[in-house]
């Protein structure tokens, strides 16, 4: 267990041109507050997923009124640290979101109004117990300077807050196999206190009070040898009574999620989906109302009408979720037509159109043939965003500029011979076949499968394809 601590040093205009306007005015005095959201791991989706490591809200800063004509200075900040307690091990890698909120204190109907001024996010590696890490993040024209650290709550120590310490019993050294607790050299690493009676040979623990069995042993105290002979399905931690391997307790057994949170197993542990009004690794943080600014991404908070709807976030376009914490993948609706590429820019959707199409959603088919000429008497045909030439006989290629070999495709069936001709091609059919492409057999009795051949042509004569 331990605490993540965040100290905001300054929030104000960043360097460079385009200084932001002050968020407060004489007519609309305001004050700032901050919100931090932490998630374990180097997750890309920190903004859209629950604050599984925890979240915290600062106090409100001093009321600030802009001095007329003055540029926006660094704004007055709330006192104190933002502290996010964590109950389990510190993960070492984490993602953060820090939001700067403005509370307007003018004559608002229904109380103060909140709006999101800036939001920064990042992914960091951090060992618990280390020094303060300093950081600068920019959001638009604003700049946020802050420091952070993770510290363990006694008796936990170590970079993950998983080792336990206790005062030295002997003045000079620690017990066998136990190291001094740097930096507290007067303390020793304590052996974990496992569940009372846990077998010292066949059991171990990673958390105080538990008893986990080595392979081949089972039972609540790991004193029962596993006998798999009478078991149907050896599958996992074993049953104390039979010594058979049975499905063991899952991370969601007993539902570790408080306040009605629902538990789902993850590859490494579990994840709680918290009801509205609760958050934290186990949904243990509660009592959230609009005064706590629970709506992310500029969502508008209104008071709900019953305890299960303590607040309601009306999300801006592009966001959803009970706290507007999820970014909507608006491109998944495939709004761009005719094969256009969809780009979700956050504030708007943009479609990048294929050649031959235009419009906000690529809905307009451009006149592909405009200004396009087909040579040698070919005609232009529109379609699919690209012009195509339908070429006159004897010509081919994209613009009908190539002289075509009409026999290249071997058009004469049943072994007929092909001859190129100024007006196309001629097939000389093999005996027994007739037709422009020698496609029709001649019946054995001399009658063809077609009406009588045109005058002047006998079956078997070369026939010209007109």
């Amino acid at each position: 267990a331990g605490v993540f601590e965040l100290q905001i040093h300054s929030f104000g205009p960043g360097p460079g041109p385009g200084a932001p306007r002050s968020p407060c005015s004489a007519r609309l005095p305001c004050r700032l507050f901050f919100r931090v959201c932490l998630k374990p791991g180097l997750s890309e989706e920190a903004a859209e997923s629950p604050c599984a490591l925890g979240a915290a809200l600062s106090a409100r800063g001093p009321v600030y009124t802009e001095q007329p004509g003055a540029p926006a200075p660094d704004l007055p900040l709330p006192d104190g640290l933002l502290q996010v307690p964590f109950r389990d091990a510190w993960p070492g890698t984490f993602s953060f979101i820090i939001e700067t909120w403005r509370e307007e204190l003018g004559d608002q109907i229904g109380g103060p109004a909140w709006s999101l001024l800036a939001r920064v996010a990042g992914r960091r590696r951090l060992a618990a117990g280390g020094p303060w890490a300093r950081d600068i993040q920019r959001a638009g024209a604003w700049e946020l300077r802050f420091s952070y650290r993770a510290r363990c709550e006694p008796p936990a120590v170590g970079t993950a807050c998983t080792r336990l310490c206790r005062p030295r019993s002997a003045p000079s050294r620690c017990g066998p196999g136990l190291r001094p607790c740097a930096p507290l050299e007067d303390e020793c690493e304590a052996p974990l206190v496992c569940r009372a009676g846990c077998s010292p040979e066949h059991g171990f623990c990673e958390q105080p009070g538990e008893c986990r069995c080595l392979e081949g042993w089972t039972g609540p105290l790991c004193t029962v040898p596993v006998s798999t002979s009478s078991c149907l399905s050896p599958r996992g931690p074993s049953s104390a009574t039979t010594g058979c391997l049975v499905p063991g307790p899952g991370p969601c057994d007993g539902n570790p999620c408080a306040n009605g949170g629902s538990c789902s197993e993850t590859p490494r542990s579990f994840e709680c989906t918290c009801p509205r009004g609760f958050y934290g690794l186990r949904c243990e943080v509660s009592g959230v109302t609009c005064a706590d600014g629970p709506c992310f991404n500029g969502g508008l908070c209104v008071g709900g009408a019953d305890p299960d709807s303590a607040y309601i976030c009306h999300c801006p376009p592009g966001f959803q979720g009970s706290n507007c914490e999820k970014r909507v993948d608006r491109c998944s609706l495939q709004p761009c037509r005719n094969g256009g590429l969809c780009l979700d820019l956050g504030h708007a959707l943009r479609c990048r159109c294929r050649a031959g199409f235009a419009g906000p959603r690529c809905e307009h088919d451009l006149d592909d043939c405009a200004g396009r000429a087909c040579a040698n008497g070919g005609t232009c045909v529109e379609g699919g965003g690209a012009h195509r030439c339908s070429c006159a006989l004897g010509f081919g290629g994209r613009d009908c500029r190539e002289r075509a070999d009409p026999c290249a495709a071997r058009p004469c069936a049943h072994g007929g011979r092909c001859y190129a001709h100024f007006s196309g091609l001629v097939c000389a059919c093999a005996p027994g076949y007739m037709g422009a492409r020698c496609e029709f057999p001649v019946h054995p009795d001399g009658a063809s499968a077609l009406p009588a051949a045109p005058p002047g042509l006998r079956p078997g004569d070369p026939q010209r394809y007109l």
């Epitope: 009605g260 949170g261 209104v302 709900g304 009408a305 019953d306 305890p307 709807s309 309601i312």
Partner: antibody, heavy 117, light 109 residues
Framework: EVQLVETGGGLVQPKGSLKLSCAVS????????MNWVRQAPGKGLEWVAR??????????YYADSVKDRFTISRDDSQSMLYLQMNNLKIEDTAMYYC????????WGQGTLVTVSA | QAVVTQESALTTSPGETVTLTCRSS?????????ANWIQEKPDHLFTGLIG???NRAPGVPARFSGSLIGDKAALTITGAQTEDEAIYFC?????????FGGGTKLTVL
């Protein structure tokens, strides 16, 4: 538009039973707690029962006047809310409403339950 | 069990401002009571006006507003109209139990 449609009311004798249903449409039923409220003829409103959502383990709450006689339940797959009423008394005669609280109160049109000998 | 008290009747004139109140026997009404205001018109026609103390329902005229005044929840009608003549109920949540007031009969003469 959110719609709540109650059915199942009718005339029943004292100590009899009746089951009311409420069909819900146009909102994500599974997310929210649901309630039954009643109004006896010429009287005010009385809250009867409440059932929370799955993530709150479908916890139920009852007014003292109906405890141990009425049972509220829900079928999330059908977006249906129910009120099983047993051992009915004459004072249970009322218009029964299916009610949902979110940003404000949403009401059905009600179904009339008359308990009479 | 908490008791919620409202004025039994109030009379106002068109264009006047009138305030209806809702008192809790357990002490001051707070935002944790999620005060709700409901309008009943003849033929059992109920309309949710205000939820969560001051959140006006969509479609409800802006002349209706909810607030906390002192230790009570309040519904204010600024510029009452004849069609506002109705019975108004307030409801307060106490954890997961809801208690209604007896209702205020508002007459607009």
């Amino acid at each position: 538009e959110v719609q709540l449609v109650e059915t199942g009311g009718g005339l029943v004798q004292p100590k009899g039973s009746l089951k009311l249903s409420c069909a819900v449409s146009a909102f994500t039923f599974t997310t929210y707690a649901m309630n039954w409220v009643r109004q006896a003829p010429g009287k005010g409103l009385e809250w009867v029962a409440r059932i929370r959502n799955k993530s709150n383990n479908y916890a139920t709450y009852y007014a003292d006047s109906v405890k141990d006689r009425f049972t509220i339940s829900r079928d999330d797959s059908q977006s249906m809310l129910y009120l099983q009423m047993n051992n009915l008394k004459i004072e249970d005669t009322a218009m029964y409403y299916c009610v949902f609280y979110y940003d404000h109160v949403y009401w059905g049109q009600g179904t009339l339950v008359t308990v009479s000998a | 069990q908490a008791v919620v008290t409202q004025e039994s009747a109030l009379t106002t004139s068109p264009g006047e401002t009138v305030t209806l109140t809702c008192r809790s026997s357990t002490g001051a009404v707070t935002t944790s009571n999620y005060a709700n205001w409901i309008q009943e018109k003849p033929d059992h026609l109920f309309t949710g006006l205000i939820g969560g103390t001051n959140n006006r329902a969509p479609g409800v005229p802006a002349r209706f507003s909810g607030s906390l005044i002192g230790d009570k929840a309040a519904l204010t009608i600024t510029g009452a109209q004849t069609e506002d003549e109705a019975i108004y109920f307030c409801g307060l949540w106490y954890s997961n139990h809801l208690v209604f007031g007896g209702g205020t009969k508002l007459t607009v003469l």
